[in-house]
Amino acid sequence: LIIGFGISGRHSITVTTVASAGNIGEDGILSCTFEPDIKLSDIVIQWLKEGVLGLVHEFKEGKDELSEQDEMFRGRTAVFADQVIVGNASLRLKNVQLTDAGTYKCYIITSKGKGNANLEYKTGAFSMPEVNVDYNASSETLRCEAPRWFPQPTVVWASQVDQGANFSEVSNTSFELNSENVTMKVVSVLYNVTINNTYSCMIENDIAKATGDIKVTESEIKRRSHLQLLNSKAS
């Protein structure tokens, strides 16, 4: 969470951003809020990116003003126009690219004053893992697959029964480059699995951490997965 202030007493407004991550090829959100103003026609929102000459996006007088927009963002940005009046200046970024990573500034002008705050935006690829029993293997084996990751993540196996155990000797992880030559498919295999146990496949890079759980009993198999973005701390 980053909170910025405008300059000089009465003419400052609070602007707040949250560091976030974008999943390449998908749509992302750059989050920014500000002290709301009831005079919509006076509100100006400017998104800028460090190292980029043109604007990322501009919203003024109730609508987008894209004449100064940088080419790399053409057709890919939008604010939530219906939410501007209540202080939401967040930017939707379509089809996130690896090169969209960097430092962004959310700059706000209202009838009450000015303010800005920076936002660190990371880009990469992350996806939910799925853990299955590999019936083709000679021994009891689990297979953890996640279709899209970048940068290359680490994969760690854990088990509920053998807490703290190191499974690196009984697991094998491979990374297969996807067709767009950036993201990779993650496949990790765990051998010598015992029943009546819950196993977790944890995939992590500097952007996201995802976990796929599988509980194997004699009568059933239960799965669960979740993904968490690793936002950078406030600065």
């Epitope: 002290e35 709301p36 005079k39 007088e61 109730g62």
Partner: antibody, heavy 117, light 107 residues
């Protein structure tokens, strides 16, 4: 859920003042504008003014400038509207209404003010 | 101030009818328009925001459209609970201003 609860009906004499309260629950009171709108019997809606409780910023309709005062008590999440120098044409129902998710998204139940000698 | 002219000021309709109410602004309000429904003795109810977005819990028979200076509220098939007065509100230019209202009565 969001609730805006207003004070009860008032009967006032011409020249007097009235103070109407609006207690808010269910959203962060200090961070969003609170507006006041009135409606004379059988008439339409008329915006009077607004307050931003977090900074006590106020905006007033020109028509009411100098006669209406908006205040807020952030400790109790209550907004107040005081109208002075009352005249018979101020007889109306007074509403507080929030701009939390959108403009005028939640409304108080209304407070009837009758000005009569 | 921006003036909002709402028409008609009243209309009579039957259950099942398609009803259209219009609001015209004296200048471009860039879709910054909401619609409200009010029944006697009750506060206005938030219906449609930013020209065309339905507020939470509002039936899909209600719809909004428009741009520039001209805006429309449509009730595709009038129900008995829809008999009420409807107001538009522009919040683009300060101060916010309401239309004069349209009373929808039973024919």
């Amino acid at each position: 859920q969001v609730q805006l609860v207003q004070s009860g009906a008032e009967v006032k004499k011409p020249g007097a003042s009235v103070k109407v309260s609006c207690k808010v629950s269910g959203y962060p009171f200090t961070s969003y504008w609170m507006h006041w709108v009135r409606q004379a019997p059988g008439q339409g809606l008329e915006w009077m003014g607004a307050i931003y409780p977090g900074k006590s910023d106020t905006e007033y309709a020109q028509k009411f400038q100098g006669r209406v005062t908006l205040t807020a008590d952030t400790s109790t999440s209550t907004a107040y509207m005081e109208l002075s120098s009352l005249r018979s044409e101020d007889t109306a129902t007074y509403y507080c209404t929030s701009t939390w998710t959108h403009y005028f998204d939640y409304w108080g139940q209304g407070t009837t003010v009758t000005v009569s000698s | 101030d921006i003036q909002m002219t709402q028409s008609p000021s009243s209309l009579s309709a039957s259950v099942g009818d398609r009803v259209t109410i219009t609001c015209q602004a004296t200048q471009d309000i860039v879709k910054s328009l909401n619609w409200y429904q009010q029944k006697p003795g009750k506060p206005p109810k938030f219906l449609i925001y930013y020209t065309a977005q339905l507020a939470e819990g509002v039936p899909s028979r209600f719809s909004g459209s428009g741009s520039g200076t001209d805006y429309t509220l449509t009730i595709s098939s009038l129900q008995s609970e829809d008999f009420a007065t409807y107001y538009c509100l522009q919040f683009y230019e300060f101060p916010p201003t309401f239309g004069g209202g349209t009373k929808v009565e039973i024919k």
